[in-house]
């Protein structure tokens, strides 16, 4: 089973130091600051799910050196930054979207020995995520226009 | 296979510094998500875990003890050290260490998988 | 600090006998709970973690279970080679604890 913890409370300060190893954040409705990071030294599990976030701001990650799991399922994701695709040893957990294939194809050029990225569809169902880019997503359209939500399943 | 072994000075009297090393095989310490913690357990009780050194060299102590805590490592040595100043006779345990590391398929979980056999410490004038 | 309370302290079972070992946390811990075995003289090996998952090799009569702040470890039908102490963990906060153990006997 995947390791859980608890919702935090709604009201985040995002000037405040979080200690624990994993925090919960689903389903609160959150806007994430562009110019803060957070601050959760020990974190290895983040969940962002559930939160209607539209992208992911690198900034916020920046200071997350021992994350290991990100979980943004049920979001509409319209881009994924490269520089957090490019941590090869972060876990992502998202919605199958057209809007991952940036993340595909940085892992794929700059991440090796890496097992296949999965995505999730709306009956939480697992799909390698070549496979869904793939089927789903013709070619060169999320990366031409920017987005590739077209795709998005709610 | 993933070993560890702890070594340590077994006697030593009040006031003094103890060191103790973790020498290991199997893995590396440079591995992103791997780290070793040092966890002591007095003679009939429980476990108290005292510090975690982190594949990047960050750190994390015991509160209660981490005036007295250093934790450091050799990466190209395969070994961990920590030492504890001013012992008392509280500080009489054994000492372990244990390894932590990130698995894909435990990948956000944090256990102890493999533990050394410990050391015996005294501290005794 | 997370304080963790294993009960009981000492139960002796009968061989085939269904055991169950409490944990409880101070606080809200999720599933971030590890149970570890120790046989005399030696060190702990880890049986459960995640508050439910087997850990590699353990045999499949040890189950785990709870979430928050109540853990359960069961030994669906106790061997005589389960003689130990029997150590919960938390690792949701540093600094990480443990509970103060639960002696199984064996009649």
């Known amino acids: 089973l995947e390791p859980s913890c608890t919702v935090s409370s709604a009201d985040v300060d995002w000037n405040a130091e979080f200690s624990a190893t994993c925090l919960n954040f689903s389903g609160l409705s959150l806007s994430l600051p562009h110019n803060q990071s957070l601050r959760a030294s020990n974190v290895i599990l983040l969940d962002l799910s559930g939160n209607g976030l539209r992208e992911l701001p690198v900034t916020f990650f920046a200071h997350l050196q021992k994350l290991e799991v990100l979980n943004v399922l049920r979001n509409p994701l319209s881009r994924v930054d490269g520089a957090l695709a490019a941590r090869c040893d972060l876990d992502l957990q998202a919605d199958c979207n057209c809007a991952l294939e940036s993340w595909h194809d940085i892992r794929r050029d700059n991440c090796s020995g890496q097992k296949p990225l999965l995505c999730w569809d709306t009956t939480s169902s697992q799909h390698n995520l070549s496979a869904f880019l793939e089927v789903s997503c013709a070619p060169g359209l999320a990366s031409a226009t920017g987005s590739g939500h077209h795709h998005h399943h709610h | 296979q993933v070993t560890l072994k702890e070594s340590g000075p077994g006697i030593l009297q009040p006031s003094q510094t103890l060191s103790l090393t973790c020498s290991f095989s199997g893995f590396s310490l440079s591995t992103s998500g791997m780290g070793v913690s040092w966890i002591r357990q007095p003679s009939g009780k429980g476990l108290e875990w005292l510090a975690h050194?982190?594949?990047?060299?960050?750190?994390r102590y015991n509160p209660s003890l981490k005036s007295r805590l250093t934790i450091s490592k050799d990466t190209s040595s395969n070994q961990v050290f920590l030492k504890i100043t001013s012992v008392d006779t509280a500080d009489t345990a054994t000492y372990y260490c244990?390894?932590?590391?990130?698995?894909?398929?435990?990948?956000?979980?944090?256990?102890?998988?493999?533990w050394g056999a410990g050391t015996t410490v005294t501290v005794s004038s | 600090d997370v304080v963790m309370t294993q009960t009981p302290k000492s139960m002796s079972m009968s061989v085939g006998e269904r055991v169950t070992l409490s944990c409880k946390a101070s606080?809200?811990?999720?599933?971030?709970v590890s149970w570890y075995q120790q046989k005399p003289e030696q060190s702990p090996k880890l049986l459960i973690y995640g508050a439910s998952n087997r850990y590699t090799g353990v045999p499949d009569r040890f189950t785990g279970s709870g979430s928050a702040t109540d853990f359960t470890l069961t030994i669906s039908s106790v061997q005589a080679e389960d003689l130990a102490d029997y150590h919960c963990?938390?690792?949701?906060?540093?600094?990480?604890?443990f509970g103060g153990g639960t002696k199984l006997e064996i009649k």
């Open positions: 050194i982190y594949w990047d060299d960050d750190k």
């Open positions: 963990g938390q690792s949701y906060n540093y600094p990480f604890t």
């Open positions: 244990a390894r932590r590391h990130r698995d894909y398929d435990s990948r956000g979980h944090w256990y102890f998988g493999v």
């Open positions: 606080e809200n811990v999720g599933t971030y």
